[in-house]
Amino acid sequence: TQNKALPENVKYGIVLDAGSSHTSLYIYKWPAEKENDTGVVHQVEECRVKGPGISKFVQKVNEIGIYLTDCMERAREVIPRSQHQETPVYLGATAGMRLLRMESEELADRVLDVVERSLSNYPFDFQGARIITGQEEGAYGWITINYLLGKFSQKTRWFSIVPYETNNQETFGALDLGGASTQVTFVPQNQTIESPDNALQFRLYGKDYNVYTHSFLCYGKDQALWQKLAKDIQVASNEILRDPCFHPGYKKVVNVSDLYKTPCTKRFEMTLPFQQFEIQGIGNYQQCHQSILELFNTSYCPYSQCAFNGIFLPPLQGDFGAFSAFYFVMKFLNLTSEKVSQEKVTEMMKKFCAQPWEEIKTSYAGVKEKYLSEYCFSGTYILSLLLQGYHFTADSWEHIHFIGKIQGSDAGWTLGYMLNLTNMIPAEQPLSTPLSHSTYV
């Protein structure tokens, strides 16, 4: 008799990453009987929601439902109908919503309420929408990359199944850059974490991890740019801001009201004699770098050592995966190769920023001008943050791996978040019997 193909015994999960600049929906899949195995969950789909981040919908909450429709319908198509009702859906909002909540809990609640109502209309098992903490964002990013890199597996392999994998079980640090915040998370070497707020303890697959994490709110690339503009316009003699972080020939008008809309620029707020000002690019990497450094207060440190703004940072240890905007920006600039030294990156940035705006527009005709115009700033900011902010050096630069995906799954906090909420990372190492992978003692 011919064997009939058995239906696939798989499970699905959906996580929406409601970031400051956009929302992305991720669909994950795993074999039902191997839930506790490490490395079995993988991403089957990413859907980027068209439009800005959810915090921008304060004045138009009635549009949130339509905004989410395309990606939720995509999820309906990708996941078999028979699985819809048991597929959990989680939405985690990050720094953009933390900033909105800082301004007004009412407005943040209103946005989340409408998001929840919209997501509840789908046939999935909606588990709620919430603003995750910066600590969670860092921790889940760290769990994601180490899960995907096989660092939690106790089986040592003589071959490498994923890039960047050294055979040892030493975990990778995680460097995450968003639009409104940036996170640094790693296991320090025998170092006391002097600040309790930055300490996390995990027991994963039978092993204890003492993890350092910090989320720098307002130091994502977009909010850092707003900070820099607010700082620099203070000393401008008129409504022209000659800005070294934009290409020569670039011009853009900025409303002062937009500049002071975010809590991130509060410390630079002042009464200006104009309602608008014009950015005029002069394209100078060195000057741009110097201007960015003024955003990092390194004069005050109440600990043995700090990153910036008085935040404790232990000595860097091991390899790091740099993902999200760290990766997207460096990928655009063609600087993600392991062979490119920090000195070479700096040289390339100097050349890139000095290129005239008209030339840049021609070379990258397919890229939206809004994004294209900011790569000089973003690239310079990444270098400044990693070198002066986190104290990487020309030598330790080679320990930074710019990662987009690992084994087909995006690096980011969403996978770690789902693994945690679905209890798929056991504290103890599961023991498999010789008979079956699905039976645990």
Epitope: R101, M102, E106, R110, R267
Partner: antibody, heavy 116, light 111 residues
Framework: QVQLVQSGAEVKKPGASVKVSCKAS????????MHWVRQAPGQRLEWIGY????????TFSQKFQGRATITVDTSASTAYMELSSLRSEDTAVYYC?????????WGQGTLVTVSS | DIVMTQSPDSLAVSLGERATINCRAS??????????MYWYQQKPGQPPKLLIY???NQGSGVPDRFSGSGSGTDFTLTISSLQAEDVAVYYC?????????FGGGTKVEIK
């Protein structure tokens, strides 16, 4: 759980300054603004101003502009409110309160008495 | 500045009866579809306690007998069935714009 613990009562002479502290715990200190509100005996509550602990930016009621200063020590999760050039009408209970627009958590209050 | 006017100044209500306090703002405290109106309860020697936020939402741990209503400039706090522990001064507050302002307070007593 969220807690705001303020410093003890103060007695000051007219013209002097007072600095009241508010130690926060149970949440990420830099994720929420800290407001200061006062209440003179038998009077309504009066908003003084607030600080963004994230970066130290502050905003004041016009009435207190130039006389009140709000600062933070993020490593100690503590906010401070200093009021200078004290006069007898500044005798009041001073409160810190956490929030953007919703003051859900308040300190226990600090009585400041201004008397010659 | 937005002026908040509360009425009455004091109110004596029998146990189990309804108490109603009004608050009028000198201009609308609504923005983006939200009323930036709050009600607080204050007992002697204690800090204010948030009862109602966004005009009609109950604060954490607040008994169901407390409810808020209204929008724009006119708002009401209702205690549906007054209990002995509700004796206090009640304040309304707006946070639509700086300076954030409070009403003069309403003292609630038992008749």
């Amino acid at each position: 759980q969220v807690q705001l613990v303020q410093s003890g009562a103060e007695v000051k002479k007219p013209g002097a300054s007072v600095k009241v502290s508010c130690k926060a715990s149970g949440y990420t200190f830099t994720d929420y603004n800290m407001h200061w509100v006062r209440q003179a005996p038998g009077q309504r509550l009066e908003w003084i101003g607030y600080i963004v602990p994230l970066n130290g930016g502050s905003t004041f009621s016009q009435k207190f502009q130039g006389r009140a200063t709000i600062t933070v020590d993020t490593s100690a999760s503590t906010a401070y409110m200093e009021l200078s050039s004290l006069r007898s009408e500044d005798t009041a209970v001073y409160y810190c309160a956490r929030g953007g627009t919703r003051f859900a958590y308040w300190g226990q209050g600090t009585l400041v008495t201004v008397s010659s | 500045d937005i002026v908040m006017t509360q009425s009455p100044d004091s109110l004596a209500v029998s146990l189990g009866e309804r108490a109603t306090i009004n608050c009028r703002a000198s201009e609308s405290v609504d923005n983006f579809g939200v009323s930036f109106m709050y009600w607080y309860q204050q007992k002697p020697g204690q800090p204010p306690k948030l009862l109602i936020y966004g005009a009609s939402n109950q604060g954490s741990g607040v008994p169901d007998r407390f409810s808020g209503s209204g929008s724009g400039t006119d708002f009401t706090l209702t205690i549906s069935s007054l209990q002995a522990e509700d004796v206090a001064v009640y304040y309304c507050q707006q946070t639509k714009e700086v300076p954030y302002t409070f009403g003069g307070g309403t003292k609630v007593e038992i008749k």
